[in-house]
């Protein structure tokens, strides 16, 4: 991150260029890759963050059973198209004119096609299941203490309204955090569960997007909670459309 002036930065997004050219000389920050102005008092959308990541210099980078429609982001990183609000465009294409439809968290939800592929709407991911495995500890964490710590994390660090953290499940060493947010529930100004999940994923990988204090300090009754594996499942309001050959 290089800011136009040393005293002008974006605390919630390292992947920005900032300068004091906003109203009244206020700091204005733009996302790398897209040049879109971002609000540094809240999370930046996942689409803009992925775009910034692709434009940055490359460097080395009681449990729920997810149902048959759950998506995992197996495709990895790509350079997405974002709309003016920073949301993923429903149709994404690569440089070789291969196209596919994505959900609101940018995960592919159809087979890949050509430029004739139509994606009528951006389908909302309304349920996210974050599956974690923690490093071995002397004993299991107290479930209610663990629940409180993770709910506090999402409320404080990501500013996600507590009502969107549906549940925290625990069977040592597996922790599952369920986030739920229907279109009708999300009010103006509410942090999107997809953005919160992405920031959390980067945090637990030691790739925090925040400046200043930076990394996570998760503790349950003083005992460090260290995550060694993360898997995230995404469930959409409309089930994905894949051909049968993908399922075999």
């Amino acid at each position: 991150h290089t800011a136009a002036q040393d005293n002008c930065t974006c605390p919630t997004n390292k992947m920005t260029v900032c300068s004091p050219d906003g109203p009244g000389g206020r700091c204005q920050c733009r996302a790398l890759g897209s040049g879109v102005a971002v609000d540094c008092s809240t999370l930046t959308s996942k689409c803009l963050l992925l775009k910034a990541r692709m434009s940055a210099p490359k460097n080395a980078r009681t449990l729920v059973r997810p149902n048959e429609h759950a998506l995992v982001d197996n495709d990895g990183l790509y350079d997405p198209d974002c709309d003016p609000e920073g949301r993923f465009k429903a149709r994404q294409c690569n440089q070789t004119s291969v196209c596919w439809c994505v959900n609101s968290v940018g995960v592919r939800r159809t087979d890949k096609g050509d430029l004739s592929l139509r994606c009528d709407e951006l389908v909302r991911t309304h349920h996210i299941l974050i599956d974690l495995r923690h490093r071995p500890t002397a004993g299991a964490f107290n479930h209610s203490d663990l629940d409180a710590e993770l709910r506090r994390l999402f409320r404080e660090r990501y500013r996600l309204h507590p009502k969107f953290v549906a549940a925290v499940h625990y069977e040592q060493p597996t922790i599952q955090i369920e986030l739920r947010q229907n279109t009708s529930q999300k009010a103006a100004g509410d942090v999107d569960i997809g953005d919160a999940a992405y920031y959390f994923e980067r945090d637990v990988k030691g790739e925090s997007l925040f400046q200043g204090r930076g990394g996570l300090d998760l503790r349950v009754r003083g005992e460090p909670l260290q995550v060694e594996r993360t898997l995230i499942y995404y469930l959409d309001e409309i089930p994905p459309k894949f051909s049968m050959k993908r399922l075999t």
């Epitope: 930065t9 809240t42 506090r152 404080e156 925040f210 400046q211 200043g212 204090r213 300090d217 503790r219």
Partner: antibody, heavy 126, light 107 residues
Amino acid sequence: AVTLDESGGGLQTPGGGLSLVCKASGFDFIDYDMFWVRQAPGKGLEWVGVINRSGSYTNYAPAVKGRATISRDNGQSTLRLQLNNLRAEDTGTYYCARGACTHCWDADSAGYIDAWGHGTEVIVSS
Amino acid sequence: ALALTQPSSVSANPGETVKITCSGGYSGYGWYQQKSPGSAPVTVIYWNDKRPSNIPSRFSGSLSGSTNTLIITGVQAEDEAVYFCGGYDSSPGYVGIFGAGTTLTVL
């Protein structure tokens, strides 16, 4: 009730060092970030520094950076401020304060203080 | 370094609504009441709009953009004090900061 009780103030000599202690009670000390804030006579409040709940992170105001060390003992529910190479401008009342947002990306903010100690007065003079 | 901007003084009659603004920081603002120099500050609002349980409900906080407002609805004589706002300096260093204080006079 939340209680924060500072001690260790008094008359100090320029160039010397001081050690202030804050004893906390009435809450789970291990769950909170802690701050030191000071106020020079007739002046406003000045943020001195912060320590996170585990003690693994500290941050200091430019005016004291390199001279100040904040530490904590969670077992004893105590917070400490060590300030070396004292100057006349270090004179003032020093307050221990509790932070209400340990996970916040801006957790160092003075806006998260939800409880204060009564303060201990420090005078740096020869 | 960033500076928090607040008015140096405001005055009001008992029963009136007082609004004191603080701008220049990011989202984590607080308001601290000090009735006399050297006496311990009292938190009236922290984290933009949260009120400690011992603070009367006439005190409230509101965040709009990067400006936080302390609102005292139906100000009383005992509310006369200096009010400091606290916030966050997002310049490298990322430290806490305070405004210079606003003296509230109840006429």
